[in-house]
């Protein structure tokens, strides 16, 4: 399995690899092979990253930030091919490499620009700050900065919040958008230029369900063709709200199958989920039971929220007792 | 084609100094090691010392440590010998020669016609 | 250090012969030897490295062999232009030169 980092060529010798926050790279050189061959890689013309002559490493002044993170295709040496496979790359590894090559027949250097990108998951949460409600789109650590955008009904929203907060490698943002009192759809895109990836959320209020006390009640909840895609792992959540928080109902993982359901009154139909319907029921429903119940989907690249007003009333039997 | 020139040779007192300097043409200067090596009249070869393509590494031959050091500006494609505290035992002609390539080899592919230095009072 | 013994220090040969010039480390240096022909007045000049390669433009009358403490510079058939000093040098730990063999006419 090769290092997940892909390569932009561009003239003068020069090459762009981009690489993920702590994961392994390659960055390529090659040269006309020939024998004696002589490699030096060099970070910002200055740090020595790795030496080989004489058939073997020499690492006596290897700049220690490279320590047991950098080898060489030995096997390929002979075949023309310097690269250098790095490991756990950092934001602080961004930079100029280069590559010398001597043999016997000739000196080459090639220069390897080495871009790192961070996109750790974002999240899209739902939250109630005393009388108002939020969306929130959120990404713990991302680099570079990414581009955030909203739409409402499809339409794109010129306001769009964000608080930032920069850590040493990376960025944390939250973009909240105040949805208080709106039965709109929203959408949330958070893209990562660099690393070519976007993640989406989606937020869908359904119509309000009134229900008698004992009743039952079955609520939706289907993917959206366009972000869904079944071979991809991801996660599905149903929870309730209560004062403010929600309480996880029962949750489904893809990749294992597995269904975890915590509250006993609780069915999810298994033919149902096979074609990816996670529609649930709720079982013999009390007064408290009102509220609003959230079905989260979420994968590496997207979060599908649709949240559901459960208002529980009374039956007119328990009404008359009254 | 490739050549060496070497400059600044004499005869000089000991305990004195004096630097020798070599002009290198015909290849890229920035993407080779260079050597200085030198001869005893009338006896064998003598490695002196190393320096780098790129000027991290310098290495000296022990009869010369401390005394000597080897230095490069690849902006003027030139190598020098800065000689502190000649003594007679110095007195020999020293070469300038080019490594096969960075210096990691170190054997002399390339030498330029030497430089005579005389120490004596 | 390594300290690299040549012999003979002088070797009587005519045209047409084959020569044989040894050189001996003091310590193991792998195939890290290179051989340089110098003649009287003259800078040296590289005639074969990592003990048997020989360098781009020399003769292929001259040959190298050996691997870690012995080691043999051969000349097939001698040409008057090859009567000269040849000098033995380990390149494995820094450097150091053999005293030499002066290759002279019988």
């Known amino acids: 399995i090769f290092p997940l980092a892909f390569f932009i060529y561009v003239p003068m010798n020069e090459q762009i690899v981009i690489g993920r926050l702590d994961e392994d790279i390659i960055l390529p050189s090659s040269f006309e092979r020939g024998s004696e061959v002589v490699i030096h890689w060099k970070y910002q013309d200055s740090y020595k990253v790795h030496s080989y002559y004489k058939g073997s490493d020499h690492l006596e002044s290897q700049d220690p930030r490279y320590a047991n993170r950098t080898s060489l295709f030995y096997n390929e040496i002979q075949n023309g091919n310097a690269s250098l496979f790095f490991r756990r790359v950092s934001l602080l590894d961004e930079g100029i490499y280069t590559c010398y090559v001597g043999t016997a027949i000739q000196v080459i250097t090639n220069k390897v620009v080495l871009k790192v990108g961070v996109f750790l998951t974002p999240v899209m949460k739902y939250e109630k700050r005393n009388t108002n409600s939020f969306l929130i789109c959120s990404v713990l650590s991302v680099y570079p900065r990414p581009i955030i955008t909203w739409k409402m009904d499809n339409t794109p929203i010129s306001e769009n919040n964000m608080e930032e907060t920069g850590s040493l490698d990376s960025f944390s943002i939250n973009s909240p958008l105040n949805i208080t009192g709106s039965n709109s759809s929203y959408e949330c895109t958070i893209e990562n230029s660099l690393l070519k990836q976007t993640w989406t959320g989606r937020w869908t209020m359904k119509d309000g369900l009134h229900k008698m006390q004992s009743e039952h009640v079955s609520l939706s909840c289907q993917p959206v063709n366009d972000y869904f895609s079944p071979n991809q792992d991801f996660k599905v959540t149903w929870s309730r709200m209560k004062s403010g928080t929600f309480s996880v109902l029962a949750y489904y993982l893809s990749s294992s199958q597995n269904t975890i359901i915590n509250e006993s009154r609780f069915s999810w139909n298994k033919e149902l989920i096979n074609q990816s319907d996670f529609s649930m029921n709720l079982m013999d429903l009390n007064l408290s039971d009102s509220g609003e119940y959230l079905c989260n989907i979420s994968s590496d690249e997207y979060t599908l929220l649709t949240i559901h007003t459960v208002h529980v009333e009374p039956s007119q039997e328990t009404a008359s007792h009254n | 084609q490739v050549q060496l020139v070497e400059s600044g040779g004499g005869v000089v007192q000991p305990g004195r100094s004096l630097r020798l300097s070599c002009a290198a043409s015909g290849f890229t200067f920035s993407d080779y090691g260079m050597h200085w090596v030198r001869q005893a009249p009338g006896k064998g070869l003598e490695w002196v010392a190393i320096?780098?393509?790129?000027?991290?590494?310098?290495y000296y031959a022990d009869s010369v440590k401390g005394r000597f050091t080897i230095s490069r500006d690849n902006s003027k494609n030139t190598l020098y010998l800065q000689m502190n505290s000649l003594r007679a035992e110095d007195t020999a002609v020293y070469y300038c020669?080019?490594?096969?390539?960075?210096?990691?080899?170190?054997?002399?592919?390339?030498w330029g016609q030497g430089t005579l230095v005389t120490v004596s009072s | 250090d390594i300290q690299m013994t040549q012999s003979p220090s002088t070797l009587s040969a005519s045209v047409g012969d084959r020569v044989t010039i040894t050189c001996r480390a003091s310590?193991?240096?792998?195939?890290?030897l290179a051989w340089y022909q110098q003649k009287p007045g003259k800078a040296p000049k590289l005639l074969i490295y990592k003990a048997s390669s020989l360098e781009s433009g020399v003769p292929s009358r001259f040959s190298g062999s050996g691997s870690g403490t012995e080691f043999t510079l051969t000349i097939s058939s001698l040409q008057p232009d090859d009567f000269a000093t040849y000098y033995c040098q380990q390149y494995n730990s820094y450097s150091t030169f053999g005293q030499g063999t002066k290759l002279e006419i019988k």
């Open positions: 320096i780098w393509y790129d000027g991290s590494n310098k």
């Open positions: 310590q193991s240096i792998s195939s890290w």
């Open positions: 020669a080019r490594d096969r390539s960075s210096g990691a080899l170190g054997y002399f592919q390339h």
